[in-house]
Interface confidence: low
């Protein structure tokens, strides 16, 4: 590492990966192990994030960038910068305070995270149900009933009201 001094601000010459070491007459010292500085002119290096427990390392820490974590299998990231891991559910389920629960009739979830959503109400767009919905899939809307051949029929179940318990705080 180049240990530089400047006649103006001695620290401005310190590149990323180093810090301006006040204890060493403001020379540019390399960041110690398990620390980094992502910009030049820093007076300290930041401690690297450690991906422990349910977190696993997605990107190792380097002298110029922090480590990045994601979650072990069966969990997914939540929050800023994957600050938390939360358990996956199966498609057709949602995570509640009592664990993973099946979507109730008239709702679906096609992901391993998130909440069950009401099936599309085809009739609102003047269409009919072409393929019925399931816990895992939304209904598929087809042509309007008037466009169907004689004798064809369709049933569009009402979209259930969402319970307040589905909202976050």
């Amino acid at each position: 590492f180049e240990r530089t001094r400047s006649l103006q601000d001695p620290c401005s010459n310190c590149p990323a990966g180093t810090f301006c070491d006040n204890n060493r007459n403001q020379i540019c010292s390399p960041c110690p192990p398990n620390s980094f500085s992502s910009a030049g002119g820093q007076r300290t290096c930041d401690i690297c994030r450690q991906c422990k427990g349910v977190f696993r390392t997605r990107k190792e820490c380097s002298s110029t960038s922090n480590a990045e974590c994601d979650c072990t299998p069966g969990f997914h990231c939540l929050g800023a910068g994957c600050s938390m891991c939360e358990q996956d559910c199966k498609q057709g389920q949602e995570l509640t305070k009592k664990g993973c629960k099946d979507c109730c009739f008239g709702t679906f979830n096609d992901q391993k995270r998130g909440i069950c959503r009401p099936w599309t109400n085809c009739s609102l767009d003047g269409k009919s149900v072409l393929v019925n919905g399931t816990k895992e899939r939304d209904v598929v809307c087809g042509p309007s009933p008037a466009d169907l051949s004689p004798g064809a029929s369709s049933v569009t179940p009402p979209a259930p009201a969402r319970e307040p318990g589905h909202s976050p705080q």
Epitope: E86, R162, G165, S167, P168
Partner: antibody, heavy 121, light 107 residues
Framework: QVQLVQSGAEVKKPGSSVKLSCKAS????????INWVRQAPGQGLEWIGN????????NYNQKFKDRATLTVDKSTSTAYMELSSLRSEDTAVYYC??????????????WGQGTLVTVSS | DIQMTQSPSSLSASLGERVTITCKAS??????LSWYQQKPGKAPKTLIY???RLVDGVPSRFSGSGSGQDFTLTISSLQPEDIATYYC?????????FGGGTKVEIK
């Protein structure tokens, strides 16, 4: 990076309305709830309500049910809160803050900088 | 609405001292409680969720405990940067409700 940028300070007369905005960037706007929380000068925090931009589903604190209206404009990734029939006790900093779509263990992870609303005759 | 009673409303402690803040819910909220730190002129920051789970990146000197109605936030060794107001939040039921806050100062 994720940012919630709120509109500027407002001074309002009692009985009038105010509409605050919160512009989101750096994430998929429709996948996270926007909550509104207020803090009167020197006081604690109070949750007003939240809205899910994907389908504009809302929840309100009963205390504000008749006076607060939460809306979103998905085309501009902006959430709005309108508070009507203002009174002096509505003077506060109003924050928008996001939570992911889970009910389960939701945490306010990003916040706007806050908008000071002053209600004075 | 669930009432959250936080105590003390303020405290003064020496650097390095152990600090304890309590929050009592008016009914059982299981473990659906989080703790926030707010510095003057800034938005709050989450420290702990589900009563005792530390948000990644928060120093390990912060810890939370409790379930049901009684909860505690502990700072094992007070640091200068911990000077702030701390709030608990219950999210077991809508509307989520905050405690009144505890202002922590240096003695």
């Amino acid at each position: 990076q994720v940012q919630l940028v709120q509109s500027g300070a407002e001074v309002k007369k009692p009985g009038s309305s105010v509409k605050l905005s919160c512009k989101a960037s750096g994430y998929t706007f429709s996948s996270y709830w926007i909550n509104w929380v207020r803090q009167a000068p020197g006081q604690g925090l109070e949750w007003i309500g939240n809205i899910y931009p994907s389908d504009s589903y809302t929840n309100y604190n009963q205390k504000f049910k008749d006076r607060a209206t939460l809306t979103v404009d998905k085309s501009t990734s902006t959430a709005y809160m309108e508070l009507s029939s203002l009174r002096s006790e509505d003077t506060a900093v109003y924050y928008c803050t996001r939570t992911w779509e889970f009910y389960y263990d939701s945490v306010f992870d990003y916040w706007g900088q806050g908008t000071l609303v002053t209600v004075s005759s | 609405d669930i009432q959250m009673t936080q105590s003390p409303s303020s405290l003064s402690a020496s650097l390095g001292e152990r600090v304890t803040i309590t929050c009592k819910a008016s009914q059982d909220i299981n473990s659906y409680l989080s703790w926030y730190q707010q510095k003057p002129g800034k938005a709050p920051k989450t420290l702990i969720y589900r009563a005792n789970r530390l948000v990644d990146g928060v120093p390990s000197r912060f810890s939370g405990s409790g379930s049901g109605q009684d909860f505690t936030l502990t700072i094992s060794s007070l640091q200068p940067e911990d000077i702030a107001t701390y709030y608990c939040l219950q999210y077991d039921e809508l509307p989520p409700t905050f405690g009144g806050g505890t202002k922590v100062e240096i003695k």
